[in-house]
């Protein structure tokens, strides 16, 4: 199954996927594209790029915003929605027969959540999810590098969610 | 009006080669994949091969792999599927057709009849 | 590969009934990615619907999609005498595209 990534609504939400050049600055094309990846190319693309640079994007919320030139393709979707969330698929088109590298990510679009747990509890949280959990305040996480992310899904969310619950934290959805 | 129209079909022997093409009109080619699909007499589609809008990137079914190379000419508007190593089982129309992963648009065929 | 089992094999019905064809997959088909083509004697296949559910450009209204997963259908809810072909399934969820074998509606 697909590894789910997760942004609050208002939120930037980033979507990791590259490759390697090979030899280092050949560029493929590269599709992003809404819903799971079909046999060939992207569905309902939302972000295409060819050998040198991106070359159509369906809305100006969608970036490549990490090092392009050095195979960093990963999709950043800016103020998401709910309607954003969703399967996405990132095709990295290697040139040849059948050699197209194919990944699926699944974005979980949630609320805003008030959280106001101990402070202790807040350090912790800042600390093992830095990006994955934002509120308003902090602003849309822009400055995130690649890898920088940890690899987050709801399992654990929903786990860090219990023990805030059974640390007396209150919790409420927007 | 988008057209596609194959040519290249024929009576040719086991063993033997053939090179199929399609002339495309009425829309932007290079800006769709293109498609082989055949289709043996009394029976059902079967998918042959596909290409990338540049041609960068081809895909075949595993039946023709090996024997069968799919290509395109841009500046001419027009497909290609060179058969080689040709078999009984390949007799069939083959249709080219546009689309990435439906197919919008298809030409009317040419019958490939592989016998000795 | 994901082999697509069409049903009935031939459907025989009078102008103006509904027709119901069933295409079942033998593997979940991803994201709806299935598309149905219509075919008469003679000429070439003829994109229906694609996405499960969305009808091609030019097509007429009394053709409809449904289906999800494994289970698919095509619905003609007012037969004209030109509905009278061969109809394909084929779906693009999975690697090779794979068509159906194929259903026959025939004038009653």
């Known amino acids: 199954s697909e590894v789910e990534y997760i942004a609050e609504v208002g939120q930037n939400a980033y979507l990791p996927c590259s490759y390697t050049p090979a030899p280092p600055g050949n560029l493929v094309p590269v599709c992003w594209g809404k819903g799971a990846c079909p046999v060939f190319d992207c569905s309902n693309v939302v972000l295409r790029t060819d050998n040198r640079d991106v070359n159509d994007r369906t809305s100006g919320r969608y970036w490549l915003k990490g090092d392009f030139h050095k195979g960093d393709v990963s999709l950043t979707i800016e103020n998401v929605t709910l309607a954003d969330s969703g399967v996405y698929c990132c095709r990295i088109q290697i040139p040849g027969i059948m050699n197209d590298e194919k990944h699926n990510v699944k974005l979980v679009v949630i609320k805003p959540a008030k959280v106001t747990p101990a402070p202790t509890l807040q350090r912790d949280l800042t600390s093992a999810f830095p990006r994955m959990l934002t509120t308003g305040e902090h602003g849309p996480a822009e400055t995130q590098t690649p890898g920088s992310l940890p690899d987050v899904n709801l399992t654990q969310i929903f786990t860090l969610t219990n023990e805030l619950r059974d640390s007396g934290a209150t919790i409420r959805t927007a | 009006e988008v057209q596609l129209l194959e040519s290249g079909g024929g009576l040719v022997q086991p063993g033997g080669s053939l090179r199929l093409s399609c002339a495309a009109s009425g829309f932007t080619f290079s800006g769709y994949w293109m498609h082989w699909v055949r289709q043996a007499p009394g029976k059902g589609l079967e998918w042959v091969s596909a290409?990338?809008?540049?041609?960068?990137?081809?895909y075949y079914a595993d039946s023709v792999k090996g024997r069968f190379t799919i290509s395109r000419d841009n500046s001419k508007n027009t497909l290609y599927l060179q058969m080689n190593s040709l078999r009984a089982e390949d007799t069939a129309v083959y249709y080219c057709a546009k689309g990435t992963n439906w197919l919008d648009y298809w030409g009317q065929g040419t019958l490939v009849t592989v016998s000795s | 590969e994901i082999v697509l089992t069409q049903s009935p094999g031939t459907l025989s019905l009078s102008p103006g009934e509904r027709a119901t064809l069933s295409c079942r997959a033998s593997q979940s088909v991803s994201s709806s990615y299935l598309a149905w083509y219509q075919q008469k004697p003679g000429q070439a296949p003829r994109l229906l619907i694609y996405g499960a559910s969305s009808r091609a450009t030019g097509i007429p209204d009394r053709f409809s999609g449904s289906g999800s997963g494994t289970d698919f259908t095509l619905t003609i809810s007012r037969l004209e005498p030109e509905d009278f072909a061969v109809y394909y399934c084929?779906?693009?969820?999975?690697?090779?595209?794979?068509f159906g074998q194929g259903t026959k509606v025939e004038i009653k």
């Open positions: 084929q779906q693009y969820g999975s690697s090779p595209l794979t």
């Open positions: 290409i990338s809008y540049s041609g960068s990137s081809t």
